[in-house]
């Protein structure tokens, strides 16, 4: 094959090599960029910056090598468009630092930075941590800071991510109230901070105020839906990012729903209860307190992490006619109480008979050869035979 005269030449089926001295000053408009998985660049002293726009369209890129070039700066978001990047070799350039944000979100198996005049500072604390934890092949490189000795020896006592304190009201919050949250940010070299409110949806009207180091957030006209929703304050500095999530408890009275009994291998009277704080529950059977046992007891389904409503069953293991009757669920919290009742009939009374029927002599024996009644314990060992959708 004839030698390739261009600045960049194909290498294999999806690779590109750019090794002609000084031919590149940026990575715009590389040929066949959208299908590239490997890009090798060498001897490009004019290539000094690597930014977001440089790698746009290189979505398939897995290996990137830029060596023996003039790279001085890599933007924190440079690799936003190359999420599949797994090997990054930036050795023998002019890099003094590299932000933690640059590699955030990538699953780098290899990161090579040897031969750069790195400047030891808190901004490289993340790289020091990679070295300590044996990540990305960093320990083998024995990285040095220019004129400062090994990266591993860099003092890091003061290199911490921001510290966040979120103040929430300690008084009870009721539906319709306005709630003021304040996020105090402390730390060195603070860069950015803000609120993440993705879970709130229609739970309140949101108004942000203030800026570093004290961020305010007003949640106006809150609803009960705000319960169990995360309100997150975040802040970043050159060391990394910190987040603190809080939840605002909005008080509201207990409510309860009962549904018709359903038969599994056991019986279930499905219920839903709601309220904040979580209501206490009590069952009545025909008006009297029902004492729960291993044959009749309350069983909750796994709660959804982001809502207060709880679903469950009054579970009855092989109930008989003595369990037929009126079941009432009482739910109460400091803001109110509620109840719901349902009639349940599990089995006819074998001792009730019509005078015209033949008189039973004794309790009929069960067919001793029957195997159809054998229950099967599910392999996942959960006592629920089927899921019951309630509410």
């Amino acid at each position: 094959a004839a030698p390739c005269p261009d600045a960049c030449c194909p290498h294999g089926s999806s690779g590109l090599r750019c090794t002609r001295d000084g031919a590149l000053d940026s990575l715009h408009h590389l040929p066949g960029a959208e299908n590239l998985t490997e890009l090798y660049i060498e001897n490009q002293q004019h290539l000094q910056h690597l930014e977001l726009r440089d790698l746009r369209g290189l979505g398939e890129l897995r290996n990137l090598t830029i060596v023996k070039s003039g790279l001085r700066f890599v933007a924190p978001d440079a690799f936003h468009f190359t999420p599949r990047l797994s090997r990054l070799n930036l050795s023998f350039n002019a890099l003094e630092s590299l932000s933690w944000k640059t590699v955030q979100g990538l699953s780098l198996q290899e990161l090579v930075l040897s031969g750069n005049p790195l400047h030891c500072s808190c901004a490289l604390r993340w790289l020091q941590r990679w070295e300590e934890e044996g990540l990305g092949g960093v320990p083998e490189q024995k990285l040095q800071c220019h004129g400062q000795g090994p990266l591993a020896h860099m003092p890091n006592a003061s290199c911490g991510v921001p510290t966040l304190k979120v103040q929430v009201p300690n008084a009870s919050v009721d539906v319709g109230d306005d709630v003021l949250l304040r996020c105090q940010v402390e730390g060195r070299g603070l860069e950015q901070a803000g609120w993440i409110l993705t879970e709130l949806e229609q739970s309140a009207t949101v108004m942000k105020s203030g800026g570093l180091p004290s961020l305010g957030l007003t949640l106006a006209n809150v609803t009960s839906d705000l319960n169990r929703k995360n309100v997150t304050c975040w802040a970043e500095n050159d060391v990394g990012r910190a987040e603190v999530s809080v939840q605002v408890n909005v008080s509201f009275p207990a409510s309860v729903q009962l549904h018709t009994a359903v038969e599994m291998h056991h019986w279930c009277i499905p219920f839903s209860v709601d309220g904040q704080p979580a209501p206490s529950l009590r069952w009545l059977f025909n008006g009297s307190v029902l004492n729960e046992t291993s044959f009749i007891f309350t069983e909750f389904l796994e709660p959804a992490a982001n809502e207060t409503v709880r679903h469950g069953c009054l579970r009855l293991n092989q109930p008989t006619h003595v369990n037929n009757g009126n079941y009432t669920l009482l739910a109460a919290n400091p803001f109110g109480q509620a109840s719901a009742s349902i009639m349940a009939a599990f089995m006819d009374n074998p001792f009730e008979f019509n005078p015209e029927d033949p008189i039973p002599v004794s309790f009929s024996p069960v067919d001793t050869n029957s195997t159809s009644g054998d229950p099967v314990e599910k392999k996942d060992e959960t006592p629920f035979g089927v899921s019951v959708a309630v509410g």
Epitope: H265, H266, N291, E292, T293, S294, F295, F297, E299, F300, N317, Q318, T320, V322, M347, F363, V366, T368, S370, G373, P375, E377, D380, E381, T382, P383
Partner: antibody, heavy 117, light 109 residues
């Protein structure tokens, strides 16, 4: 597979207390009730009580109400029975047994408690 | 408290059918008593066999079956085997507590 593991032997002095353990594995501990049963030679089996591992709800045989206290540790999937003011009458084998549906289906191998000075 | 009574001992031969019974001092055993049958083998190895009168526990051989016969709970072993030699305890549920019978020692000769 479902397993209920109990220490083989406990030796304690009269008047003291003891906490017997039943460490479970192979199933979702919090979904089941655990029962405790006493066996004395020549006296058959006596039911002591039951506990719901999910919330610690208990029911006791009247005879053992002031003798036994049942608890659970969800983090280690372990059921416990504390026996207090021990006398020679408490010397016996104590079993934990899992309740599933209408069965006492899986039993521990028992802890032999000896109360002796 | 109720008393639950079982035969103290029974003997059968391999291949034969044998029935063990369980009587309640409070009257007829009913489905509300959720009669359980538990097998004890040497070295204190207990296994639940039958629950709720006639439900076999998972993994229990089909030769074991439970029923109500008259006013008693019954455990029938159809085609007994030598490994069935054991002590069999009946347990009855009385609303909020179990009461065990004294056990039947079954010998398979």
């Amino acid at each position: 597979q479902v397993q209920l593991q109990q220490p083989g032997v406990e030796l304690v002095k009269p008047g003291a207390s003891v906490k017997l353990s039943c460490k479970t594995s192979g199933y979702t501990f919090t979904s089941y009730w655990m029962h405790w049963v006493k066996q004395r030679p020549g006296q058959g089996l006596e039911w002591i009580g039951e506990i719901y591992s999910s919330n610690g709800l208990t029911n006791y045989n009247e005879k053992f109400k002031n003798k036994a206290t049942l608890t659970v540790d969800k983090s280690s999937s372990t059921a416990y029975m504390q026996l207090t003011s021990l006398t020679s009458e408490d010397s016996a084998i104590y079993y934990c047994a899992r309740h599933w549906y209408v069965f006492l289906d899986h039993w521990g191998q028992g802890t032999t408690l000896t109360v002796s000075s | 408290q109720a008393v639950v009574t079982q035969e103290s001992a029974l003997t059968t031969s391999p291949g034969e059918t044998v029935t063990l019974t369980c009587r309640s001092s409070t009257g007829a055993v009913t489905t509300s008593n959720h009669a359980n049958w538990v097998q004890e083998k040497p070295d204190h190895l207990f296994t639940g066999l039958i629950g709720g009168i006639n439900n076999r526990a998972p993994g229990v051989p089909a030769r074991f079956s439970g029923s109500l016969i008259g006013d008693k709970a019954a455990l029938t072993i159809t085609g007994a085997q030598t490994e069935d030699e054991a002590i069999y305890f009946c347990a009855l549920w009385y609303s909020n507590h179990w009461v065990f019978g004294g056990g039947t020692r079954l010998t398979v000769l």
